[in-house]
């Protein structure tokens, strides 16, 4: 039959070449001569020429040594034709198996792999993997198939087995204890990829293991004991700074340190917080501290990290004594600020009030005073007992120097110390109203026509304060009730000037009286220009004329 | 001589709790990771649990997960295994074990722990 | 079920060798060289004979080997006394959890 079984030929022949491989034989040669031919791949086509076949006899030849990882099977078509050029057969398909030889050397992907494992892990737990290839075949044959293997691990600390490789997949596990980054940070592992499945060809590369940090060491003070001096009352002052070594990966949170005041800081006085590059633990005042009630402070702080421990680890603690030194302290007025009422117009040499400082210091030390700030200059201080006492008129109604009835005063206190130290108190005066001011009409100029005049209504107002104000009272004097009429309207905050009488134009002189609800008398002059009109007016020419 | 003993075996009730310790000696014990293992009556090895050397990995079989806390005190030279919620099933000599290079030694002697009503 | 697989008895007269087999899959006893051998006396703890495949901790009599290949471990007793008669269980360092594979044992009987 003009058929032919797959033809299997090994890579890496040595020849001789051409070589024989097999006869490609048409049964029609029996009645006329038969002329052979192949095509395809391999032998017309690229790459041309790697087989052919003897065109009288049929024998399929090999032209030379084949590469089964460039190509591992060729498609051929055997070709039978007459004399005459007449094909006489189909096509033959002609499988050429090339059949593979351990010719390549298994290659690692990199030459340096890099993995990592937590310092301190189980046996058991996997790394990393690494990979190597081999082209030859690892399906037929056993030349492709690679084991792995670790040929050396450096250091040899604890000891040389401390991690394992998978032989069929590569990946890298720990199989013993011990592994402590704070005694070897890194590994580096040569292994070894074996074809023939650990029978054959090697090569070897790199994998370096990095040890990551677990935070199994605690943060340690070195020293354990301090001493600080502070100065009483400073805020904010650094009492002492605090120094630890731990052994984890600097500036990770296993590293990085958390103060804690255990003991010893009843009143809140102290915080404590980490440096953010030194990892000290800087201790500071968050109140002030006072020498007169305790002088010496003892505190515990404990340090822990960031992160947790991962195993139970004993904590350091730090003893600091703490002293606080003495320092000359300001009096302190007692109160702050001391209001105080007091009536307006008190006559000068009056006592006002006594405002007297107390000192923090336990010495008896002598307190003088005096006045800082007094504006209307209406106060003396004595020196020695802190009595005020009136040396102007207190006036109320001063809208100079008395806002909302309250007149301000600083004083000051100085002790004899060495160096003197001042405080300063606030002494707010209250001052009560006296019926000191007469009710005032506004506006003290009108202008009224002499023909149906218009009544003039004036505003009433008094400085003082209820009940020294309305309702007010409205006297016409000095004859001008003869022309004149004022009456003061329910309310008694306004006062109702009429013209009786005729007068010519001219301007007039209205004398008129108001009392307020305390009888507080006030004579004002209004100053009428009287023009020669009907009802409403606001200007008219005319000379002036007393009246 | 390096040395595992166990303590705290015993009877309990299904339900019941139970804390084996295992002290070790004669080894740096906070260098090993240590494990338990046990074996009911007539039966094979069962590894049970797992802890490294610092005490931060642990492992459980999933037979025991969420009941059974593994713990050591590197300070006593102490493994614990606190055992909760025991069923008839735990019922088992235990042994404590070092872990390491793919094998296990020494070994403690073993405590029976009897959970039955 | 046991992971790894043991005859469960084997037997043999004073004197002679006996072979104790402990098969695995490619994940474990194929993957690593960390097969070990027990032997547990009715009773007592189990006591390691074999590490690492072959290797032998010190005390152990030399009549106790191992080899492997492939999947399957190997625990020969050549010279076989009396005091062999026990339960030997095989164990295997396997990738992923449970990391220990135990065989159901194998009772070696002292004809």
């Known amino acids: 039959d003009w058929v032919v079984a797959p033809i299997s030929v090994p890579e890496n022949g040595k020849g001789p070449f051409p070589q024989r491989l097999n006869q490609l034989k048409s049964n029609k040669d029996r009645d006329t001569k038969i002329f052979y031919s192949i095509t395809g791949p391999g032998a017309d086509s690229p790459p041309e020429g790697v087989f052919a076949v003897e065109k009288e006899t049929g024998w399929l030849l090999l032209n030379k040594p084949l590469d089964r990882e460039e190509i591992a099977k060729y498609e051929l078509f055997g070709h039978a034709v007459s004399e005459n050029g007449a094909s006489v057969e189909d096509p033959m398909n002609i499988s050429i198996i090339v059949t593979d030889q351990n010719d390549h050397k298994p290659k690692f992907t990199q030459d340096t792999f890099r993995g990592s494992v937590l310092e301190g892990v189980l046996p058991g737990t996997s790394v990393m993997q690494v990979t190597a290839t081999d082209e030859d075949d690892a399906i037929y044959t056993y030349n492709g198939v690679v084991a792995y293997s670790i040929h050396s691990q450096e250091p040899k600390d604890p000891h040389d087995l401390m991690f394992t490789i998978h032989r069929s997949t590569g990946t890298i596990s720990v199989i013993s204890s011990g592994l402590d980054r704070e005694k070897v940070p890194e590994y580096t592992l040569t292994i070894q990829a074996t074809d023939m499945d650990g029978d054959g060809s090697t090569t070897t590369a790199v994998a370096v293991v990095e040890i990551l940090d677990a935070n199994d060491n605690a943060p340690m003070f070195d020293p354990q004991k301090y001493e600080a001096h502070v100065p009483e009352n400073a805020v904010g002052h650094e009492v002492q700074r605090l120094t630890v070594t731990d052994l984890d990966a600097p500036n990770s949170p296993a590293w990085r340190a958390t103060y804690l005041i255990m003991g010893g800081d009843d009143g809140d006085h102290f915080t404590i917080t980490t440096h953010p590059e030194s990892n000290q633990g800087i201790l500071t005042t968050r109140k002030g501290l006072d020498f007169e009630a305790k002088n010496q402070h003892t505190l515990y702080v404990e340090v822990t990290n960031e992160a947790p421990f991962v195993l139970k680890l004993p904590t350091s603690t730090a003893t600091i004594v703490v002293h606080v030194e003495d320092v000359n302290e300001a009096p302190v007025f007692v109160p702050p600020s001391k209001v105080v009422e007091v009536q307006e117009g008190i006559p000068t040499g009056e006592p006002v009030c006594v405002y007297t400082a107390e000192d923090p210091d336990k010495e008896n030390q002598k307190i003088s005073y005096r006045i800082l700030r007094d504006p209307a200059g209406w106060l003396a201080m004595d020196p020695d007992s802190g009595q005020v006492t009136a040396v102007g008129t207190l006036d109320r109604e001063d809208e100079q120097f008395v806002r909302n009835n309250i007149y301000e005063v600083m004083v000051l206190a100085m002790d004899n110390g060495s160096p003197p130290t001042t405080g300063t108190g606030t002494l707010l005066l209250t001052l009560i109203d006296v019926n000191d001011h007469g009710p005032v009409p506004e506006p003290r100029q009108i202008t009224i026509c002499n023909q149906s005049p218009v009544r003039q209504v004036l505003n009433i107002t008094d400085k003082d304060l209820s009940p020294h104000t309305s309702p007010f009272q409205a006297q016409l004097t000095d004859d001008s009730d003869i022309y004149w009429t004022a009456e003061v309207n329910e309310e008694g905050d306004t006062v109702v000037l009429s013209l009786k009488k005729f007068l010519k134009q001219d301007t007039y002189d209205v004398h008129l009286s108001l009392s307020d609800h305390g009888n507080k008398e006030q004579l004002t002059v209004i100053r009428a220009t009287v023009c020669d009109c009907h009802g409403h007016v606001e200007t008219c020419p005319g000379p002036w004329k007393g009246g | 001589e390096v040395q595992l003993l166990e303590s705290g075996g015993g009877l309990v009730q299904p339900g019941g709790s139970l804390r084996l310790s295992c002290a070790a000696s004669g080894f740096t014990f906070s260098s090993y990771a240590m494990s338990w293992v046990r074996q009911a009556p007539g039966k094979g090895l069962e590894w049970v649990s797992a802890?490294?050397?610092?005490?931060?990995?642990?492992y459980y079989a999933d037979s025991v997960k969420g009941r059974f806390t593994i713990s050591r005190d590197n300070s006593k030279n102490t493994l614990y295994l606190q055992m909760n919620s025991l069923r008839a099933e735990d019922t088992a000599v235990y042994y404590c074990a070092s872990w390491g290079t793919g094998t296990l030694w020494p070994w403690g002697q073993g405590k029976m722990v009897t959970v039955s009503s | 079920q046991s992971a790894l697989t043991q005859p469960a008895s084997v037997s043999g007269s004073p004197g002679q060798s006996i072979t104790i087999s402990c098969t695995g899959t490619s994940n474990d006893v194929g993957a690593y060289n960390y097969v070990s051998w027990y032997q547990q006396h009715p009773g007592k703890a189990p006591k390691l004979i074999l590490s690492e495949v072959n290797k032998r901790p010190s005390g152990v009599s030399n009549r106790f080997s191992g080899s492997k290949s492939g999947n399957t471990a190997s625990l020969s007793i050549s010279g076989l006394q009396a005091e062999d008669e026990a339960d030997y269980y095989c164990s295997s360092f396997t990738s992923g959890l449970p990391w220990v594979l135990f065989g159901g044992g194998t009772k070696l009987t002292v004809l």
């Open positions: 802890i490294s050397g610092s005490g931060g990995s642990t």
